[in-house]
Structure formats: structure tokens, C-alpha cells
């Protein structure tokens, strides 16, 4: 911590500008007014302050706002956000999506840090649910965000938000997460026609029950093998050979390459050999 010393004559900062990069840490502490800093936070982002200087500026804000920064300051933190600890962020009340975007922008290109995770958690809890605009924003910055949530957290996602989800956002989701998201997606896309519906629901099908897969098999959807391999084993097992053939359409030939992998392996073992032979793929039950 920088010791308290009087500001030298003529060095009191009238504004936050580039001249401050030439101040020593103790001079910043002594000569920069915390209230001035708070009102001119937007300028800090354009000035090449060192790590050490940013520490001093953070310390000044901490002294001014011991209960947590107001959103007017948070929105303009810029690179100073990277200096915040999760404990600092837990004191904040962030309600504006613009503030969230501004801070996520600072961390862009990096993995989700504990600071960012805490910020998002505070923001979502403050809103009460993960609405479409928030989900849009979060998945734009972190495509894997949705799959980082627990099934319990996902349960607060309203079906209307599902429209913001892109296939790549679900790449790392496990079956438990898809179990929660699938019914929401089914509800969100229910008014779409067959082919459009399948395009939208496809990436959520890892959470689909048997009866929905049976229904899809009646719609000439031509599911690809990559999607089929992500289906729940317990949902695939009751499907008949005819239903799987209809579900996969021309992609049915791909079953041969996947015959040793779940869920194909388990499904094959449940079928009568005569039925498997009708596929002409040499599958052995």
C-alpha cells in the first residue's frame, strides 16, 4: 500500500489525463482526487497506466466506495476491471446490460475468469432469470457459457431465451443439462413447421425422450449420425429398426462405422437379428 504523503506543489491533478502516467505511485495516491477519478473513469481506459498505477487507482476507488462501486463507475472501469477480485464484485449491483457488455469486452479473448463468472452470477441473480438479451450477450462472448451452468441454474432460463442459443453454444453440454434445455426448446419452437422445427431443435435432442424421437421418425428429418450419437441411450433403446431407419434416412449407413459405440452398440444388442439384417449393413446383434 502507498504511504500517505502530501501532494507536491503544482502536481494536483485537475483531470484524469496522460500526464498521470509519469506520476509515481505515491504521487498518484496523493495528487489524484478519488471523486474526480470516479467521474472521469472512462478516460482511464485510454491511458497506458502500469499494473502498479492501476493498483493505486483501484485503491482510491475502494476508499471512496467501501460498500461497492456504483454502476456509473462500474460501467467505465475498463482495464481496471481486471484488477477486481470476486470479493470486490460481490459488493456490486449491476443491472444494465450495457455495463455487463462493457466489462465482458475488457476480458474478450480470454477464458472466463473468476471475476467474470462472479460478475455474470451477480447480474443474472439481479435480473431473476436468464432472459434472451442476456443470454445473447453471454453466449456471444462465451459460447460455452450455457453449458457451464448447473441443471438447477438452467431451470431459470425461460423458453423465450432459447431463441438466442446457437448450436455451438451446446457443444459442451452434458445429458443432464440437455434434459433441462430440451423441453424449453420444444416449447419455444412448437409453432414451427416440420423441417424448420428440426433445424432448430436438432442441437437440443440430447435431452429428447423416446416418444419425441418416434414422432420425429415420422417426419422424414434425415438426422445425421453426429446428432444420433448424442441422443440419450435410454431414449434410443426402445426404437425399432424401422424407426431408426426412418429417423436417419440416407444417413442410416453410418451405423456400421459406429456399431461399437454407444448408443448404437446398446441399441443393436436390443434388436432382433432378422430386423437388423433388413438394413443390409452387416450389423451383428
Amino acid at each position: 500500500e502507498v504511504e500517505k504523503t502530501a501532494c507536491p506543489s503544482g502536481k494536483k491533478a485537475p483531470e484524469i489525463d496522460e500526464s498521470l502516467i509519469f506520476y509515481k505511485k505515491w504521487e498518484l495516491e496523493a495528487c489524484v482526487d478519488a471523486a474526480l477519478l470516479a467521474t472521469q473513469m472512462d478516460r482511464v481506459n485510454a491511458i497506458p497506466f502500469t499494473y502498479e498505477q492501476l493498483d493505486v487507482l483501484k485503491h482510491k476507488l475502494d476508499e471512496l466506495y467501501p460498500q461497492g462501486y456504483p454502476e456509473s463507475v462500474i460501467q467505465h472501469l475498463g482495464y481496471l476491471f481486471l484488477k477486481m477480485s470476486p470479493e470486490d464484485i460481490r459488493k456490486w449491483n449491476v443491472t444494465s446490460l450495457e455495463t455487463l457488455k462493457a466489462l465482458l469486452e475488457v476480458n474478450k479473448g480470454h477464458e472466463m475468469s473468476p471475476q467474470v463468472a462472479t460478475l455474470i452470477d451477480r447480474f443474472v441473480k439481479g435480473r431473476g432469470q436468464l432472459d434472451k438479451d442476456t443470454l445473447d450477450t453471454l453466449t456471444a462472448f462465451y459460447p460455452g457459457y450455457l453449458c457451464s451452468l448447473s441443471p438447477e441454474e438452467l431451470s431459470s432460463v425461460p423458453p423465450s431465451s432459447i431463441w438466442a442459443v446457437r448450436p455451438q453454444d451446446l457443444d459442451t453440454c452434458d445429458p443432464r443439462q440437455l434434459d433441462v434445455l430440451y423441453p424449453k426448446a420444444r416449447l419455444a419452437f412448437q409453432n414451427m413447421n416440420g423441417s424448420e422445427y428440426f433445424v432448430k431443435i436438432q442441437s437440443f435432442l440430447g435431452g429428447a425422450p423416446t416418444e419425441d424421437l418416434k414422432a420425429l421418425s415420422q417426419q422424414n428429418v434425415s438426422m445425421d449420425l453426429a446428432t444420433f450419437m448424442k441422443l440419450r441411450t435410454d431414449a434410443v433403446l426402445p426404437l425399432t429398426v424401422a424407426e431408426v431407419q426412418k429417423l436417419l434416412g440416407p444417413h442410416v449407413e453410418g451405423l456400421k462405422a459406429e456399431e461399437r459405440h454407444r448408443p448404437v452398440r446398446d441399441w443393436i444388442l436390443r434388436q432382433r437379428q432378422d430386423d437388423l439384417d433388413t438394413l443390409g449393413l452387416g450389423l451383428q446383434g
Epitope: I21, F22, A46, T50, Y79
Partner: antibody, heavy 119, light 106 residues
Amino acid sequence: EFQLQQSGPELVKPGASVKISCKASGYSFTDYNMNWVKQSNGKSLEWIGIINPNYGTTSYNQKFKGRATLTVDQSSSTAYVQLNSLTSEDSAVYYCARGGYDNEAMDYWGQGTSVTVSS
Amino acid sequence: QIVLTQSPAIMSASPGEKVTMTCSASSSVSYMHWYQQKSGTSPKRWIYDTSKLASGVPARFSGSGSGTSYSLTISSMEAEDAATYYCQQWSSNPPTFGAGTKLELK
């Protein structure tokens, strides 16, 4: 050991541009600001500007603003200065110099890059 | 910008002699830094924050001053000290250098 290795000498025509590199090694590149300094044939030194390699933020000497551009490539720990619309006045040796902790002057300097502007 | 005036511009000293060179600022500065440069090489940080010696600098060197008046002193000149010494202020934007004092061996 700390080292700032600069690119080789440049002979350029008036009106052209030049880009000089400075590769840092032996320390964490993003932890210290990088300065650029001009020295015209054996004369004194002129500060061009400074860049924070972590955020890419810059500050320039007003005299060089608009004609000098400072950039960094974090992946290769390299700082650059690009000088545009060169005239004979720009013939000089250009140095990169690391900013010392807590503004304790410029603690490590590159070996310098000679730029000659001549038609 | 702050102008730094170094004097003398050129000086010579015999081995063992005490040497003092000065740097005068057009406005008050918090600290002064000094660099040593030998012909054909890059400058080296020599004295920083007015009076702190950089790593490897012999103890015969010292720096002092405040406000607008600063100086570099060598208590006993040695041959290896022959070089040009530049003062530099880092207190005001932009940082500026003096024109240098060239110290020669007599």
C-alpha cells in the same frame, strides 16, 4: 538476462514509411511499458511515446503524434514503431526502452536501429 | 514542455579528479534521471529518482538536487567514466532530455 533486440538498419526514400521491431526477452513482456526514443546523429534524445503491452494503450509526444504509431504483438513479445511520411529530419537512431518499475526511468534499452532517409 | 539545460556541454577531467555536472529544469520536477552513453552504444540508466544508482554503477557516482536544480557528481574520475551523460525528467508530459554533458579524460 533481460534483452531488447531491435531490427536492422533501414534505408528508405522520402515520403515512405518504416516499421522497426523490438523483441523483448528475459522478463514478462506485458508487465512493463515500452518507450521509443529518437537520437539524431550523435545529438540528444527525444521521447516519441509509450505503450502498455498488456492493453495496447499509448501516449505520444505531441511532436510525433499522427506520424508515429506504436503497437505490440503479445504472442511474440515484440513492440513496434511505425514512422510515416519520412523526411531527412527523421534520419536517426531509434531505441526501444523499457519503462522501469514505478517510473524509475528507462531501465533497459535496445541496441538501436539506424534509419536513413535519402533519395 | 519542460526544457532541461545541461552544463557544461563539454568538460574534461584527470583521473582522480572530482567531477560535477548540472541539469537545470525550466519548471520544477519531482525527480531527475541520468543516463550514460558511450560512442556507438545505447544509453544506460545510470542514476534514477535523483539519487539512486542503477545496478552495476560504481559508488563514486552520486546524484542530488530538487525543484529545478540537479547535479551528477563523480568523486574520483576514472578512465571508464569518459562518456556523454544525459539528464531526463519523467515528471511532466512529455518526458524530456537535456542536450548532454560530454565528459572527456584529460
